[in-house]
């Protein structure tokens, strides 16, 4: 008895495709050895047609694939554009030669079936509507019209012109005539189900003078599209159900036993297992929509179906589209932290991996919002202005060539808790989801800036100190000036006469920043932070207000700005999140499923880009040593 198992008999018709799954024992050797599909010849020799080593025969070129799924101990042979010549005996097997472990498979490809001469073949998908056309002669214009379905020798009436409708076709079948036509009637059957398939006869009149037409109805179950994705990557299900369901609620469900469990629908239902990593995006007014899932897990593999129904739930006889998702555990996407914890008033540094081959791609960070179908407005990007409400506390540090960029968010409040996505305008698989959990702080922050009321006077010298604990002693300390396109680390060199310097007193564990002399453009947010090489750690922020030397002149009180860093009153946070920012890049990740849209958004962001070069501190008067 062969330990390999698969379908012994596979049958199909010309032009179709088959997908043959072969199961093998779960051993390390089997998982990694060569998989093959060969055709048995009369001489006993089995000629390889395709193998996992990359071999593809000429007759299979462009129409076949072999995919190994080591985590399931299966491999799948897909063969498209079948012809009758494909009929024959095959083996699916494992081993370096075609004599190893194998299973015999018989493939039979038939011609498209013949029907009586006057038979019209109608091919429709499940859930769709078929219109059967029935011609008749003028003599039967006033006679009874009917459509019946053949069951063996009998023909059971489906509908007739006396308004009879078979109960199983109730509310689905209508018989009608169009306009002034006197020689044709029509029967519509909607919400088709597989058992509707078969031979139908439509008839006008009775007895020998009756006019009859044969119709063969084929109801196709959607053939699942096979999707192969890496662990931790993302997948987009593009669903196009047609205009007839444009106004019905849409859903994506996952098959589980005999049910299909809704993952997300347009009525607000969402499976908790997909919280923070799913978006449903309407595409147009014709019922098209897409569902994007990020951070793929092993358990996400399976059969998915999208559909439409007013209930937002799967219903038999409504159009569906199907996929089978395979999740490959041998992923190129590195494993990164899925939960990051912070405390109020503190900061987090989130490392976002991206495809190292695409170091020039635009990087973005967005906040997943649960409302309706889920959305992810961009908060910061390499060429997108920081969203209002995040000024002075959010920056993206690109580290070209490292395959990662870092997003730092400080002045944390509990309202920052939630899910965030790292994404680029390049390889769409590299989208990672991070859950940020912000707890109430129970102790003083590690980094503290003095004075907290930072007001500098133009032309004078201004020094601000950042106190750090001993645990940061060996780490690099830095000050940077925040701007809308990043936080530019202050240069570690003298700027001549202006005498800017940062000195670190090891005994008192202070890193201080001096502005000398203060200029108007020095006003703004400054960050004190620690890092080790490219790895960023804790940061804290302070707003430095700049005022004229003249006595009695009004100045901006920085207290409010710095109070937000500590307390972030809810009213202010709420108001800032509602306000419109005319200048912000309109990067709406509801469009992310369509890669062109993120590109367009990136272009637009470039137009809106704030002047200033990331990583350069030109024109600033701060410096650090």
């Amino acid at each position: 008895q062969s330990p390999i198992f698969g379908p012994q008999d596979v049958s199909s018709i010309e032009g179709n495709s088959v997908s043959i799954t072969c199961y093998y024992p779960d051993t390390s050797v089997n998982r990694h050895t060569r998989k093959y599909w060969c055709r048995q010849g009369a001489n006993g020799y089995c000629a390889t047609l395709i193998s996992s080593n990359g071999y593809l025969s000429k007759e299979y070129s462009g129409r076949a694939s072999l995919i190994n799924f080591p985590e399931n101990s299966t491999f799948v042979i897909n063969i498209a554009h079948l012809t009758q010549e494909d009929t024959g005996s095959y083996k699916c097997g494992l081993g370096t030669t075609n004599r190893g472990l194998f299973f015999d498979v018989s493939l039979e490809v038939s011609q498209v079936p013949e029907f009586p001469n006057d038979t019209h073949v109608y091919t429709k998908d499940i859930g769709r509507t078929v219109t059967i056309e029935c011609r008749f002669k003028e003599g039967n214009a006033h006679s009874k019209k009917s459509l019946c379905k053949k069951r063996g020798e009998a023909c059971e009436v489906v509908i007739d012109s006396t308004e009879y409708v078979d109960p199983s076709y109730k509310d689905r079948a209508i018989l009608f005539m169009k306009g002034t036509s006197r020689d044709i009637f029509y029967v519509n059957i909607s919400h088709l189900i597989p058992s509707d398939a078969g031979l139908y006869v439509c008839q006008a009149g009775e007895g020998p003078s009756a006019d009859k037409n044969n119709a063969d109805l084929q109801v196709l179950e959607p053939e699942p599209e096979l999707l192969y994705k890496d662990l931790r990557s993302s997948v987009t299900f593009e669903c196009d159900l047609g205009r007839e369901v444009a106004n019905d609620a849409k859903y994506l469900c996952r098959k589980n036993k005999e049910t299909c469990d809704v993952i997300i629908n347009t009525l607000g239902k969402r499976d908790p297992a997909f919280e923070g990593r799913i978006l449903l995006t309407p595409r147009d007014d014709n019922g098209r929509f897409s569902v994007l899932i990020t951070g793929l897990r092993k358990e996400d593999a399976g059969h998915y179906q999208c559909g439409a129904h007013s209930s937002g739930l799967p219903q038999e006889g409504w159009p569906v589209q199907a996929w089978q998702l395979f999740v490959n555990e041998e992923s190129t996407i590195p494993n990164s932290r899925s939960v990051v914890k912070g405390v109020t008033g503190g900061s987090v540094a989130i490392v976002c991996p991206y495809n190292p081959k695409e170091s020039s791609s635009l990087k973005y960070w967005c906040h997943w919002e649960a409302d309706e179908n889920g959305r992810c407005p961009v908060l910061v990007g390499t060429q997108a202005l920081v969203q209002e409400g995040y000024e002075g506390r959010l920056a993206l540090f690109d580290q070209p060539g490292s395959g990662a960029y870092t997003v730092i968010l400080n002045q944390l409040t509990t309202q920052d808790s939630g899910f965030y996505w790292c994404l680029t305008d390049g390889d769409s698989r590299w989208r990672t989801t991070i859950e940020l959990q912000v707890a109430e702080a129970t102790k003083k922050p590690d980094l503290e800036v003095t004075p907290q009321n930072a007001t500098a006077v133009i032309g004078e010298t201004f020094t601000i100190s950042c106190h750090y604990p001993c645990k940061f002693y060996s780490q690099e300390k830095y000050w940077c000036k925040w701007s809308n396109d990043g936080c530019h680390i202050l240069p570690s060199h003298d700027e001549g006469a202006r005498q800017s310097s940062v000195s670190c007193d090891q005994s008192s564990q202070i890193v201080s920043m001096t502005l000398n002399p203060v200029k108007k453009e020095d006003e703004g947010w400054y960050w004190c932070g620690v890092k080790e090489g490219q790895v960023y750690g804790e940061t804290t922020a302070i707003y430095v207000a700049v005022e004229e030397r003249t006595r009695g002149s009004p100045h901006i009180n920085p207290t409010d700005a710095n109070a937000r860093a500590k307390d972030a009153p809810e009213e202010e946070a709420m108001e800032s999140s509602v306000r419109e920012d005319e200048n912000k890049a309109n990067l709406d990740p509801r469009l992310f499923a369509d890669e062109r849209e993120i590109q367009n958004a990136g272009d637009q962001a470039q137009e809106n880009r704030a002047s200033g070069n990331a990583g350069s501190a030109g024109g600033q008067s701060g410096s650090s040593k």
Epitope: D9, S12, E221, K257, E258
Partner: nanobody, 126 residues
């Protein structure tokens, strides 16, 4: 849930034939594996054959002991699956069950308790 009703079992002599039927109701079974299993007293249910179909492609699976003797088939319009058993042997004596499950994974495994028929007895005597 799918309701399954088997019929066609009975007594037959060695070498004889039987045709088992499994009628499904409750929902169409086009997206299912429809399988036949058998059980003899004191033993586990064992896989005999299964069928699945996608569009106009059909896939038939058999256990080694059924190959060449048993044929599984279906009638879509009737939502029915058949098992034609030829060259029957005394060791084929068992209660034959029809089962359904979504078309995912190995057709020999993991059929849910609520997707089984009540069974039909097949007795082969020498």
């Amino acid at each position: 849930q799918v309701q399954l009703v088997e019929s066609g079992g009975g007594w037959v002599q060695t070498g004889g034939s039987l045709r088992l039927s499994c009628a499904a109701s409750g929902r169409t079974v086009s997206s299912y594996y429809m399988g036949w299993f058998r059980q003899t007293p004191g033993k586990e249910r064992e896989f005999v054959a299964a069928i699945s179909w996608v569009g106009s492609s059909t896939y038939k699976y058999y256990t080694d002991s059924a190959k060449g003797r048993f044929t599984i088939s279906r009638d879509n319009a009737k939502n029915t699956v058949y098992l034609q058993m030829n060259s029957l042997k005394p060791e084929d004596t068992a209660v034959y069950y029809c089962a359904a499950r979504p078309r995912v994974g190995d057709p020999r495994s993991r059929y849910d308790d609520d997707n089984w028929g009540q069974g039909t007895q097949v007795t082969v005597s020498s």
